[in-house]
């Protein structure tokens, strides 16, 4: 059977190492059946998640899944932190797992680390 609940597929323990000054698109994967749900992004601040009202977002539709994208153009140092997407569906609020952005400020780094370095050596983010 095909479930017609809305599903948000951000992965548990999801994280992305990105560079300040670069563009970045943060994906919220969404599965739905007939009507596309209203999806929003928020940024975690302690135990509350602050809704991101004025940020550029867009939908990307693929064959088996859709993406609600939060655009960073460009990434700023204070974009560092954890984000969550949520969907309103039939009066229910569905929340995703959180996803964490680790932002390296290239101005403060002695050299620009590669994506591979950032993926395999997370301590580069804090030097």
């Amino acid at each position: 059977k095909e479930s017609c609940d809305v599903q948000l597929y951000i992965k548990r323990q999801s994280e992305h190492s990105i560079l300040a000054g670069d563009p970045f698109e943060l994906e919220c994967p969404v599965k739905y059946c007939a009507n596309r749900p209203h999806v929003t992004w928020c940024k975690l601040n302690g135990t509350t998640c602050v809704k991101l009202e004025d940020r550029q977002t867009s939908w990307k539709e693929e064959k088996n899944i859709s993406f609600f994208i939060l655009h960073f153009e460009p990434v700023l140092p204070n974009d560092n932190g954890s984000y969550r997407c949520s969907a309103n569906f039939q009066s229910n609020l569905i929340e995703s797992h959180s996803t964490t952005l680790y932002v390296t400020d290239v101005k403060s780094a002695s050299e620009r680390p590669s994506k591979d370095e950032m993926a395999s050596r997370p301590w580069l983010l804090y030097r």
Epitope: Y9, Q13, N64, D116, A119
Partner: antibody, heavy 116, light 107 residues
Framework: QVQLQESGPGLVKPSETLSLTCTVS????????WTWIRQPPGKGLEWIGH???????HYNPSLKSRFTISADTSKNRFSLKLSSVTAADTAVYYC??????????WGQGTTVTVSS | AIQLTQSPSSLSASVGDRVTITCRAS??????VAWYQQNPGKAPKLLIY???SLESGVSSRFSGSGSGTDFTLTISSLQPEDFATYYC?????????FGQGTKLEIK
């Protein structure tokens, strides 16, 4: 329609480094997660690890730290490196797309034999 | 790591039979289970995701159920092309482990 194609040497000598590439056509690796799985002869499937659209990686800790997954967005492909191979690394290696809910697209697999 | 134990490891059945394969997780994994079919010399093929959702293009004789630690794959009426090996996989926690497989053979 997204298609995946593995490539690499069929035969590797013990202690050498194995390099495999998965070329993605019909879609971009700038979305989704991209996975490597292996299957030793006559045995089950083993999840090696994956790389995300941003370049972040997760690996199977039971496989020690000999694996490295990387991606080349300009060539729309991702790669697996395995250092210090032994006979126990003989397997069919598959690349697959993690469509977030499951591994929904697979390559046909490439057989790797470790032998001197 | 989360362990997935499939039972039975092998199963003999006839065309037209109803068959059930089970997958038990070592801890609660909600509904984050997928089922795959693998024929000899071929790559696995996705059948079921989220424990009970049928992948597009897959025959409706395949169905999945379960949540928490116990999951089942059912084939309602076996066809000749269904004789293969079946694997469950969990997506709840890293690493994304597979069950050891269930080989379905013709009786």
């Amino acid at each position: 329609q997204v298609q995946l194609q593995e490539s690499g040497p069929g035969l590797v000598k013990p202690s050498e480094t194995l390099s495999l590439t998965c070329t993605v056509s019909g879609g971009s690796i700038s979305s989704y997660y991209w996975t490597w799985i292996r299957q030793p002869p006559g045995k089950g499937l083993e999840w090696i690890g994956h790389i995300s659209y941003s370049g972040s990686t997760h690996y199977n800790p039971s496989l020690k730290s000999r694996f490295t997954i990387s991606a080349d967005t300009s060539k729309n492909r991702f790669s697996l490196k395995l250092s210090s191979v032994t006979a126990a690394d003989t397997a069919v290696y598959y690349c697959a797309r993690d469509g977030y809910y499951a591994l929904d697209v697979w390559g046909q697999g490439t057989t790797v034999t470790v032998s001197s | 790591a989360i362990q997935l134990t499939q039972s039975p490891s092998s199963l003999s059945a006839s065309v037209g039979d109803r068959v059930t394969i089970t997958c038990r997780a070592s801890q609660d994994i909600s509904n984050t289970v997928a089922w795959y079919q693998q024929n000899p010399g071929k790559a696995p093929k996705l059948l079921i995701y989220d424990a009970s959702s049928l992948e597009s293009g897959v025959s409706s004789r395949f169905s999945g159920s379960g949540s928490g630690t116990d999951f089942t794959l059912t084939i309602s009426s076996l066809q000749p092309e269904d004789f293969a090996t079946y694997y469950c996989q969990q997506f709840n926690n890293y690493p994304y482990t597979f069950g050891q497989g269930t080989k379905l053979e013709i009786k």
